[in-house]
Interface confidence: low
């Protein structure tokens, strides 16, 4: 009855984490079993950047330092499973840590922009300001959104200009609008890796005004925007 070395469940274990993951975060785990049922102790080999530690009992792997994405990805280390007791036979597997900028939430409008209006007829081109956001964490950098009109046909009537990384201005190109609601599609790009885009709609009403407010049937409340 020959004593056998521990056997890993995989030849290569792979995990993906953000480069900005907090120190102490669990980034993955490995598992091995010993054919004779002996306990196993896990250790790391080749952690040249000093980024990781492994729980020698559970095989859980944790970050212990900032993960510097410029150092290259994936980060490859070896995991060693050694029998506790017996003849201390060991096996080696690979652990690959893929560093990512987490960017999985497309941009959206920061608040509810229903009820935008201009008093009709326009005496001069008008504009309004809107804000975008997303649900990604921005640790080293804040959002850097870029803005454009969502379809070419809108360009005759509207233009959008960036104010900063989160705000943009929607302006009318002329004053000849009908007394009705226009839905302006805005394309917002987050410039991430990979870049994500959101297309949002800004409903803008051109309406007759009474004392600076949109004259509407009861139950329709509208917010005034300066122009």
């Amino acid at each position: 009855d020959v004593n056998e070395a521990p056997q890993f469940s995989q030849h290569v274990f792979q995990a993906k984490v953000s480069e900005d993951v907090a120190i102490g975060t669990k980034v993955g785990n490995v598992t091995a079993k010993d054919p004779e049922g002996l306990d196993i102790s896990y250790s790391l080999r080749g952690d040249t950047r000093g980024w990781l530690k492994i729980d020698h009992v559970t095989g859980e792997i944790f970050s212990v330092a900032p993960l510097d994405r410029e150092a290259g990805s994936p980060y490859r280390v070896q995991v060693v499973a050694t029998e506790v007791g017996g003849s201390s036979l060991s096996s080696v597997s690979e652990f690959h840590l893929i560093l990512m900028d987490v960017n999985d939430n497309p941009p959206r409008l920061a608040k509810d922009y229903t009820g935008l209006f201009f008093c009709h007829p326009l005496s001069a081109p008008g504009s309004l300001i809107f804000e975008a956001t997303d649900d990604d964490q921005h640790l080293f950098r804040g959002p850097h959104f870029t803005f454009s009109l969502g379809s070419g046909s809108l360009q005759n009537d509207w233009e959008v200009s960036k104010i900063n990384g989160t705000h943009a201005r929607l302006s009318t190109r002329h004053t000849e609008f009908e007394e009705r609601e226009y839905v302006v599609l805005i394309r917002i790009n987050d410039g991430g890796r990979p870049p994500l885009e959101g297309i949002v709609s800004l409903p803008v009403t051109f309406c007759s005004c009474v004392e600076g407010s949109c004259f509407r049937p009861a139950g329709h409340k509208h917010h005034h925007h300066h122009h």
């Epitope: 950047r49 000093g50 330092a65 900032p66 510097d68 410029e70 150092a71 290259g72 890796r193």
Partner: antibody, heavy 118, light 107 residues
Framework: QVTLKESGPGILQPSQTLSLTCSFS??????????VSWIRQPSGKGLEWLAH???????RYNPSLKSRLTISKDTSRNQVFLKITSVDTADSATYYC??????????WGAGTSVTVSS | DIQMTQTTSSLSASLGDRVTISCSAS??????LNWYQQKPDGTVKLLIY???SLHSGVPSRFSGSGSGTDFSLTISNLEPEDIATYYC?????????FGGGTKLEIK
């Protein structure tokens, strides 16, 4: 052989914009893992990290100067640029560019001296 | 920001001496520390990275050690060409910060 060389105006006046160029050879800024930083050293003082640009055009700035700094690159010409707006006499220093790979500034340029004086 | 402090701004030693230059961080930096040498002409070179790893081409008389917040650079057998200012630098958190430097002179 990796080399970097900084160039700048030498002397400029307060409130002007300082434009610096780092020309390098022996490596490519299109290679994954590569980056270039700017570091400065006022005469007789220590080193201060200013900005870094990654191979994929991602950028990092020192928060204390971020509003005045712009780092950029021309990968095809093997050049990295730094602009500092609204300079003051406190910006007088020797400015270095350095290759940053695996978290180290492993090769530095010789530096270029900049004096801000009215 | 993480403050890097080199308490000794200048140090005088004799050729052949063993010299130790210290550096402390205002918070733990997980061994994310480099050492640089700046010659009197302004030339800067990397000596040690990740606290104790010797950069290629650097003489073995240079060594680094430390952990947590306290680190040191040791020159085991001082040579004339070692006359320079030595800087520590952390890369645990942005912004990257340097110590104030320790100027090494010959007695």
């Amino acid at each position: 052989q990796v080399t970097l060389k900084e160039s700048g105006p030498g002397i400029l006046q307060p409130s002007q914009t300082l434009s610096l160029t780092c020309s390098f050879s022996g490596f490519s800024l299109s290679t994954s893992g590569m980056g270039v930083s700017w570091i400065r050293q006022p005469s007789g003082k220590g080193l201060e990290w200013l900005a870094h640009i990654f191979w994929d055009d991602d950028k990092r700035y020192n928060p204390s100067l971020k509003s005045r700094l712009t780092i950029s690159k021309d990968t095809s010409r093997n050049q990295v640029f730094l602009k500092i707006t609204s300079v003051d006499t406190a910006d007088s220093a020797t400015y270095y560019c350095a290759r940053r790979v695996l978290s180290t500034f492993d090769v530095w340029g010789a530096g270029t001296s900049v004096t801000v004086s009215s | 920001d993480i403050q890097m402090t080199q308490t000794t701004s200048s140090l005088s030693a004799s050729l052949g001496d063993r010299v130790t230059i210290s550096c402390s961080a205002s918070q733990g930096i997980n061994n994310y520390l480099n050492w640089y040498q700046q010659k009197p002409d302004g030339t800067v070179k990397l000596l040690i990275y990740y606290t104790s790893s010797l950069h290629s081409g650097v003489p073995s008389r240079f060594s680094g050690s430390g952990s947590g917040t306290d680190f040191s650079l040791t020159i085991s057998n001082l040579e004339p060409e070692d006359i320079a200012t030595y800087y520590c630098q952390q890369y645990s958190k942005l912004p990257l910060t340097f110590g104030g430097g320790t100027k090494l002179e010959i007695k």
